[in-house]
Interface confidence: low
């Protein structure tokens, strides 16, 4: 079989809410993937599993099932949303994200995604990892690629 290419494009939007009492931040992060099928037969995108890490801690997970079928030599753009929670031992971030004296409250998150495709009864998994900036202080819609954090090293928090 020819390759199935998965390209993580970036964060599409991040919607934020807070629990003042619990000093907790809720971020619903919608990401965009391009999946290209270089085969001459359709492949099924069986599932997408994603997780988001902040400072090496998993803050959100999501799984989508039976997503789509991608035709031969075709590409589909797929959006998926990961609900994340920044709380407990990371509640110190609540102060940063709600600080009104700064305009942009960017935090660096690591997006991990695994796409499982099937064809002719075979399964194939392709994984990607990307660091992305997300504003935890307001609802934000991003132009694709705008949120990329280009430093390949794990950033210090």
């Amino acid at each position: 079989p020819r390759s199935i290419d998965v390209k993580y494009i970036g964060v599409k939007s991040a919607y934020v809410s807070y629990d003042v009492q619990k000093r907790t931040i809720y971020l619903n992060i919608t990401n965009t993937l391009n999946i290209t099928n270089n085969n001459y037969y359709s492949v099924e995108v069986e599932n997408i599993t994603a997780q988001v890490q902040f400072s090496k801690t998993v803050i959100g997970k999501a799984r989508l099932n039976n997503i789509t079928i991608i035709g031969p030599l075709d590409m589909k753009q797929i959006d998926y949303t990961v609900p994340t929670v920044i709380a407990e031992e990371m509640s110190y971030m609540y102060d940063f994200c709600t600080l009104i004296s700064i305009k942009v409250h960017n935090i660096v998150l690591m997006m991990q995604v695994t796409v499982t495709t099937t064809y002719f009864g075979h399964s194939e998994q392709i994984s990607q990892e990307r660091y992305q900036y997300v504003d935890c202080g307001r609802n934000t819609t991003y132009q694709l690629g705008q949120s990329e954090y280009l430093n390949v090293l794990q950033p210090q928090q």
Epitope: P1, Y40, Y41, S42, E44, P72, L73, D74, Y119, F120
Partner: antibody, heavy 122, light 107 residues
Framework: QVQLQQSGPELVRPGTSVKVSCKAS????????IEWVKQRPGQGLEWIGV????????DYSEKFKDKATLTADKSSNTAYIQLSSLTSEDSAVYFC???????????????WGQGTSVTVSS | DIQMTQSPSSLSASLGERVSLTCRAS??????LNWLQQEPDGTIKRLIY???SLDSGVPKRFSGSRSGSDYSLTISSLESEDFVVYYC?????????FGGGTRLEIK
């Protein structure tokens, strides 16, 4: 019923190019691939390449990458193969064929055009 | 590229006889193999797809099977219109490759 009607025979000069057409009818053109296959006189079949008429995406056998260009016109349900810098080696019958695509059947050419004879001669 | 070695290249047989043609794949192709028939006027028709599935309208005397990397087309009782050329085609990977063909001749 499904039909792939190819254009008529061509007699062309060396060094020129030729465009062969394959008009599809009896099915949804953009839901199937169109494959192209070459057959030299008295020889076997050789796969040239494939086009997805829906998006126009193509892929070619390495051997034909610089020789053949595949295109498709959705408005007329017609696929084309253009052969360039023709030599006597390009004298052959060219077939188009339809391929259903499905996760389970995969590439499985089910209907063939009648073939178009291209003769390269000075 | 996957090589498809088809044998025999020609075969003489009598009406009513049972014959088998074979294609050997150089790599694993699963069940992704077709058998094609080419008439003297050049017309190509698919007989068998996915190794053993018979196309609609194809007589039941044609059948396809597999044993390891060997794929066979069997004609149980030859009729006059069967004396043409047959090709196998693998569609497991790109580029698609054909067997060299078998010319079936009347004895």
């Amino acid at each position: 019923q499904v039909q792939l009607q190819q254009s008529g025979p061509e007699l062309v000069r060396p060094g020129t190019s030729v465009k062969v057409s394959c008009k599809a009818s009896g099915y949804a053109f953009t839901n199937y691939l169109i494959e192209w296959v070459k057959q030299r006189p008295g020889q076997g079949l050789e796969w040239i390449g494939v086009i997805n008429p829906g998006g126009g995406n193509t892929d070619y056998s390495e051997k034909f990458k610089d020789k053949a260009t595949l295109t498709a016109d959705k408005s007329s349900n017609t696929a084309y193969i253009q052969l360039s810098s023709l030599t006597s080696e390009d004298s052959a019958v060219y077939f188009c064929a339809r391929s259903p695509y499905s996760s389970y059947v995969g590439y499985a050419v089910d209907y063939w055009g009648q073939g178009t004879s291209v003769t390269v001669s000075s | 590229d996957i090589q498809m070695t088809q044998s025999p290249s020609s075969l003489s047989a009598s009406l009513g006889e049972r014959v088998s043609l074979t294609c050997r794949a150089s790599q694993d192709i699963g069940s992704n193999l077709n058998w094609l028939q080419q008439e003297p006027d050049g017309t190509i028709k698919r007989l068998i797809y996915a190794t053993s599935s018979l196309d609609s309208g194809v007589p039941k005397r044609f059948s396809g099977s597999r044993s390891g990397s060997d794929y066979s087309l069997t004609i149980s009782s030859l009729e006059s219109e069967d004396f043409v050329v047959y090709y196998c085609l693998q569609y497991a990977s790109s580029p698609r490759t054909f067997g060299g063909g078998t010319r079936l001749e009347i004895k």
